[in-house]
Interface confidence: low
């Protein structure tokens, strides 16, 4: 049975709390629900950084910081509709993650 892909969660992992230009940054994107194979795309300021496919556990992407700050997001697509994560904003002083849950209208 096909399972709709859920909205992925993007996690940024840095080697230290105070990140600096040149640091290696690890991006992890995972949709907790979705089948079969999920294609993950990573974005910086809406520009595609790269993509990776995974059956489970999400996907990783590594990059070296070349800018002082920026907005990162990822997208999960299982061929039955894509979902994009909340944007994670990276500052030189650390990470700020913005996520939202359901609300009643």
């Amino acid at each position: 049975v096909a399972v709709p892909v859920s909205r992925p969660v993007l996690t940024l992992r840095a080697p230290r709390a105070q990140v600096a230009v040149g640091d290696l940054l690890e991006l992890h994107c995972e949709a907790l629900r979705g089948s079969p194979l999920i294609l993950y795309q990573f974005y910086h300021e809406d520009v595609t950084l790269g993509n990776s496919s995974a059956l489970s556990g999400g996907a990783f992407f590594n990059l070296s910081l070349t800018a002082e700050h920026g907005n990162y997001s990822c997208e999960a697509d299982n061929g039955l509709g894509a979902q994009r994560s909340e944007t994670v904003t990276l500052y030189l002083t650390g990470l700020t993650e913005n996520r939202s849950g359901p609300v009643a209208t």
């Epitope: 049975v1 997001s73 509709g81 979902q83 994009r84 996520r99 359901p102 209208t105």
Partner: antibody, heavy 118, light 106 residues
Amino acid sequence: QVQLQQSGPELVRPGVSVKISCKGSGYTFTHYAMHWVKQSHTKSLEWIGMISSSSGNTNFNQKFMDKATMTVDKSSTTAYLELARLTFGDSAIYYCARWSYYALFDYWGQGTTVTVSS
Amino acid sequence: ENVLTQSPAIMSASPGEKVTMTCSADSSVDYIHWYQQKSNTSPKLWIYDTSKLASGVPGRFSGSGSGNSYSLTISSMEAEDFATYYCFQGSGYPLTFGSGTKLELK
């Protein structure tokens, strides 16, 4: 705040087509897929299908495959549902609804009433 | 298609009364979500992920269940709770709703 504004009611003859719209505002339109749901007295709530607001890819309930066409216009942040070859059984309220991270509909449009009458 | 069967279809209750409605799925699902709908309005997300209350939903509401069987309970009915409640599954295509339970004033 998040809003989904749908087009007004439609009174149409059998056999014709109708196109209804759903304008999303108050959020990043391309980050959320849009779904369409039919509500009739006989069948309660029925999922018609969804469209990715970013890619335009669609996924249908097989029951509506030959009835419905879904499109999206990113520039105007509007999703469209076209219903073809209308019959009396297509008379219903049609809702657009935003698909959230939790695999559910978190916001709904106000609904568009389609009445098929000769 | 995963058919969701709600019961009862219509339930009469009085303010202050405890009510429970059920939703049975043909096939096992990870989660059930509940929507509340009042006359001439759109459905509103009420309970998500089986037991979590959506923003603004009173604490007298609760949800439970797993697998094929789920329920929504109102511990003490209030006037504003009279409405139709639909269960919904987003775990598999086609997405499906239950036929609804209408709560009426006794």
